[in-house]
C-alpha cells in the first residue's frame, strides 16, 4: 500500500510521544513535499511530479529512492551530497526523466549505492567520470553492483554527427563511463538493452570481471567477432536476443562454452544459414548453455527461412560459389 504523501513517517507522533511520559520527541524526519516517504521501508518515492532537480531535503534514512518520471535534464556533480550524507542509500532509480547530461561525480558521497537505474533517459552527455567520481587513472572502487542503462540512446536528431557516426560516438561515450578509473570492478549486473549498439567496444568486458548478468538485448549487434567473454568467469546470463546477429564464429562459441555457469539467450536474431553456420549448428546440438535453442530459426537465405537451426545438417548449409571478378556485377 502506498505510504501517505509528504507525511513524516516516524512510528510515533510527537503528541503521542509526549503523552507517553518521555521528556522530548525524536526528531521527525522531513519528507520532501513532492514525495512519499516510508521510514519503516526506508523508501522515498518522488514519482511523476515534474521535478526539475533532486529534492534537497531527502531524509537520511533513505535506502531506496525513486525519482522516476520527472523533468530533470541535468544531474550535476554532487547531486546527492547531503549533510549528513545519505549513507544508507542502496538503490537509486532515475529512469524515465529527461536527463541529457550526467556530470562527473554525480553520484559521489553515496558510499552504499549498490543499484543505479538511468534507463529511458536520452543521454547525450554521460561524463566519463559519472560513475568513477574522480578523474584519476585509478579511482576508488565504486560500490555499484547493478547498473541499468536500458534505452539511454538519444533520438537520432539529438545525436552528434548524424546517424552512424553518432552511434559510434554514443557507444564510445558509454564505454568510457564504464571503464573510467577501473571503478566498476565490482559490478555484477549491467543492462544495456535497447540502445541501437552496432558493436560492443572490445575493452569494456575485460574491465568488468565480476559481471554475473549482461543484457545486450534489442540492440543492432551484427557480430561478436571482436568481443571477448573469456575473462567473465562468473557470468551467469548473457542476453543477446533481438539483435542483428548472423552467425557466431568458433572463437565466440569456444569462449561461451568455457564459462562454467553461463546461460545465453539468442532468440530473434536473423541467422544466416549458409556454409558459415556449420560450426554454430554443431555447437548448438551439443551445448546446454543456450536457452530455448530449439526456437532459433534461419532468416536467410530465403530458401532456408524458418528452418530450425538445430535441425540443420552440413548438406543444408551451402554457400553460393563466388563468381570470378570478370563475371561479377556491381
Amino acid at each position: 500500500s502506498a505510504p501517505s504523501s509528504s507525511v513524516p513517517s516516524s512510528s510515533t507522533s510527537p503528541a503521542a510521544f509526549l503523552a507517553s511520559g518521555s521528556a522530548q520527541p525524536p526528531p521527525a524526519e522531513r519528507c520532501p513535499a513532492a514525495c512519499e516517504c516510508s521510514e519503516a521501508a526506508r523508501t522515498v518515492k518522488c514519482v511523476n511530479r515534474n521535478l526539475l532537480e533532486v529534492p534537497a531535503d531527502l531524509p537520511p534514512y533513505v535506502r531506496n529512492l525513486f525519482l522516476t518520471g520527472n523533468q530533470m535534464t541535468v544531474l550535476p556533480a554532487g547531486a546527492f551530497a547531503r549533510q549528513p550524507p545519505l549513507a544508507d542509500l542502496e538503490a537509486l532509480n532515475l529512469s524515465g526523466n529527461h536527463l541529457k547530461e550526467v556530470c562527473a561525480g554525480a553520484f559521489e558521497h553515496l558510499p552504499g549505492l549498490r543499484r543505479l537505474d538511468l534507463s529511458h533517459n536520452p543521454l547525450t552527455n554521460l561524463s566519463a567520470f559519472a560513475f568513477a567520481g574522480s578523474n584519476a587513472s585509478v579511482s576508488a572502487p565504486s560500490p555499484l553492483e547493478e547498473l541499468i542503462l536500458n534505452h539511454i540512446v538519444p533520438p537520432e536528431d539529438q545525436r552528434q554527427n548524424g546517424s552512424f557516426e553518432g552511434m559510434v560516438a554514443f557507444e564510445g561515450m558509454v564505454a568510457a563511463a564504464l571503464l573510467a578509473g577501473r571503478a566498476l570492478q565490482g559490478l555484477r549486473r549491467l543492462e544495456l538493452a535497447s540502445n541501437h549498439f552496432l558493436y560492443l567496444p572490445r575493452d569494456v568486458l575485460a574491465q568488468l570481471p565480476s559481471l554475473r548478468h549482461l543484457d545486450l538485448s534489442n540492440n543492432s549487434l551484427v557480430s561478436l567477432t571482436y568481443v571477448s567473454f573469456r575473462n567473465l568467469t562468473h557470468l551467469e546470463s548473457l542476453h543477446l536476443e533481438d539483435n542483428a546477429l548472423k552467425v557466431l564464429h568458433n572463437g565466440t562459441l569456444a569462449e561461451l562454452q568455457g564459462l562454467p555457469h553461463i546461460r545465453v539467450f539468442l532468440d530473434n536474431n536473423p541467422w544466416v544459414c549458409d556454409c558459415h553456420m556449420a560450426d554454430m549448428v554443431t555447437w548448438l546440438k551439443e551445448t546446454e548453455v543456450v536457452q530455448g535453442k530449439d526456437r532459433l530459426t534461419c532468416a536467410y537465405p530465403e530458401k532456408m527461412r524458418n528452418r530450425v537451426l538445430l535441425e540443420l545438417n552440413s548438406a543444408d548449409l551451402d554457400c553460393d560459389p563466388i563468381l570470378p571478378p570478370s563475371l561479377q556485377t556491381s
Epitope: N268, T297, A299, N306, E311, L312
Partner: antibody, heavy 116, light 107 residues
Framework: QGQLQQSGAELMKPGASVKISCRGT????????IEWVKQRPGHGLEWIGE????????YYNEKFKGKATFTADTSSNTAYMQLSSLTSDDSAVYFC?????????WGQGTTLTVSS | DIQMTQTTSSLSASLGDRVTISCRAS??????LNWYQQKPDGTVKLLIY???RLHSGVPSRFSGSGSGTDFSLTISNLEPEDIATYYC?????????FGSGTKLEIK
Amino acid sequence: QGQLQQSGAELMKPGASVKISCRGTGYTFRSYWIEWVKQRPGHGLEWIGEILPGIGSTYYNEKFKGKATFTADTSSNTAYMQLSSLTSDDSAVYFCARGGRDFDYWGQGTTLTVSS
Amino acid sequence: DIQMTQTTSSLSASLGDRVTISCRASQDINNYLNWYQQKPDGTVKLLIYDTSRLHSGVPSRFSGSGSGTDFSLTISNLEPEDIATYYCQQYSKLPYTFGSGTKLEIK
C-alpha cells in the same frame, strides 16, 4: 513449396476428446515448427501453441494449457492436436501452419462442432 | 501478452483505390510483424513478413511499413481478388498474438 493437409470436420459431444491431424508435404517436415491456431465463428485468429516435430519440443499459450496437447510423427510427416473435455467454447475452425518467424503455409482448417 | 489492435474492423473501397490498413502493438515489437490474408472461403495466406518483406508469390501491389508499435499494410491498386479479411500478427514474444482483423469490401 510446402503444403499442409488437415483432417476433416468433426462433430463431438461435450466432455469428449478429439484429435485433429495435419500432414506436411513438399518440405523437410521435422525442421519447421507446426503452429496451431483457433478461429471461432465471427472471431479473429488465436494462437494455441506449436510443436517442433524433429525434437518434440512444444510451447503452449497459457490459455490452452490443459486443453490442447500436441504430438508429431516424423515417419508420416504428421502433427496432431488433441483437445480434451470439449465444451461449446471449443467449437471453432482449427488451423495448422508451418511456423518460425512467420506462418508461411497454412492448412485448409478443420471445423470442430461440439454439441449434445 | 502483447495486444495487437486493428481499430478499423471493416473498410469499403473501390477497385483501383489505394487502401491502407493499420495495426498497433501494445508495446514495442521492433519489426517483428506479419500480415495475413483470409479469403471468404477461409483460406489463409502470408502476405508480408518482418513488417515489409513480401512473401513469395504475393503481388507487388501489397506493401508493409512501420516499426515499434505502429504498422500498416497498403494495397496500392485494389483488385477484386483482394476482398478478404487482413490480420496483423506479432512474433516478438510468446504467445504470438493477432489483431482482430480488418474486413475489406468493394464499394
